[in-house]
């Protein structure tokens, strides 16, 4: 009876999410393997988040709007482990917008989800950021490593979206 009601609840939750995401990929987790954590297909998952790499070349503002329509934001990178996971799926000859910008050009960087910008947990390439006119951040491969660079926001780039996992 308990299992039946839990299944019914799950199905109704799945139906609710289906209007936003036609397909979800779920895995069982939790100490009793009773919880399901899901990401939209074909997003990838890491820890408590889902990630989507958009190969559409768009400005930073349009990229953020595009993520927003999918219930996500441009990616906020909190740890080196998270960055290492993300970069496994990136092409080394491409650049991807992050959810990091400096709209006034005062070198006051801010994350799209209002996560405080912590200078100690940043992965700028050497010598970056280097221009007050370059007010948006990308991640790209340079000098044998992945790192961040400030670029013009209006220049179209690929992008990475991030959202919280869906728990059902």
């Amino acid at each position: 009876n308990f299992m039946y009601s839990k299944t019914v609840k799950r199905l109704s939750k799945l139906q609710e999410y289906q209007q936003y995401y036609p397909s979800l990929t779920c895995v069982m987790e939790g100490k009793d393997m009773e919880d399901w954590s899901c990401c939209p297909t074909p997003w990838t998952s890491f820890q408590s988040s889902c990630y989507f790499i958009s190969t559409v070349m768009q400005s930073w503002t349009k990229s953020q709007n595009n993520c927003s329509v999918m219930g996500a934001d441009l990616v906020v990178i909190n740890t080196k482990e998270e960055q290492d996971f993300i970069t496994q799926n990136l092409k080394i000859n491409s650049a991807y917008f992050l959810g990091l910008s400096d709209p006034k050009g005062w070198r006051h960087w801010q994350w799209v989800d209002q996560t405080p910008y912590n200078k100690n947990v940043t992965f700028w390439h050497s010598g970056e950021p280097n221009s007050p006119d370059e007010r948006c951040a990308i991640i790209n491969f340079r000098s044998e490593e992945w790192g961040w660079n400030d670029v013009h926001c209006h220049v179209p780039q690929k992008s990475i979206c991030k959202m919280k996992k869906i728990y059902i």
Partner: antibody, heavy 121, light 111 residues
């Protein structure tokens, strides 16, 4: 006082080349992105190319890509536009313009007087 | 590319009256309260001159008779009251994404 002075325009045959120059003064040239914008006779404004302050970024519309090259010499406070394989439709007044960044975009806050390019046989 | 459509193509206004020019973008040029639409005035034989930046900010030295408003896709330049030396072509321009694009222009004539 900010000044932008274009030169190098003239009459050229189709398929020919021209190099336009823009001499900048009255501001720290190396700190600003610059653009070329053109205006065909009796027509509206058309952006032609952009170069970032540090020379790291150049951008062109499809109509001139592969034929025009924008460059700058910050030591000489000068902006250039090398125009090759010129066509009749490139006939226009060419303006150099300074870009001023605002939030996620920019606008053109100062313009030169323009130099006229005529492509005709 | 973002297409900017200006209307009307031309208008004739008497001195002291109000002139209103609209610019419609094919997609939004706004982001979180910032509107990346700008307006220029061009008199015959002269280069364009910046009037308004970011939809509503008056460029230094431009008379307060000029004002701008709008958001997302619809923007307006208003001249009130119009003076004789306002006869010119007026252009809108967006910069939210490359390539930067201009409207086709509006010719303002003084009756």
């Amino acid at each position: 006082e900010v000044q932008l002075v274009e030169s190098g325009g003239g009459l050229v045959k189709p398929g020919g080349s021209l190099r336009l120059s823009c001499a900048a003064s009255g501001f720290t040239f190396s700190s600003y992105g610059m653009s070329w914008v053109r205006q065909a006779p009796g027509k509206g404004l058309e952006w032609v190319s952009t170069i970032s302050s540090g020379d790291s970024y150049t951008y062109y519309p499809d109509s001139v890509k592969g034929r025009f090259t924008i460059s700058r010499d910050n030591a000489k406070n000068s902006l250039y536009l090398q125009m090759n394989s010129l066509r009749a439709e490139d006939t226009a007044v060419y303006y150099c313009a300074r870009q001023l960044y605002y939030s996620y975009g920019y606008y053109f806050d100062y313009w030169g007087q323009g130099t006229t390019v005529t492509v005709s046989s | 590319d973002i297409v900017l459509t200006q209307s009307p193509a031309s208008l004739a206004v008497s001195p002291g009256q109000r002139a209103t020019i609209t610019c419609r973008a094919s997609e939004s040029v706004s982001f979180h309260g910032t509107h990346l639409m700008h307006w220029y005035q061009q008199k015959p034989g002269q280069p364009p001159k910046l009037l308004i930046y970011a939809a509503s900010n008056l460029e230094s030295g431009v008379p307060a008779r000029f004002s701008g408003s709008g958001s997302e896709t619809d923007f307006t330049l208003t001249i009130n009251p119009v003076e004789a030396n306002d006869a010119a072509n007026y252009y809108c321009q967006q910069s939210i994404e490359d390539p930067p694009t201009f409207g086709g222009g509006t010719k303002v004539e003084i009756k």
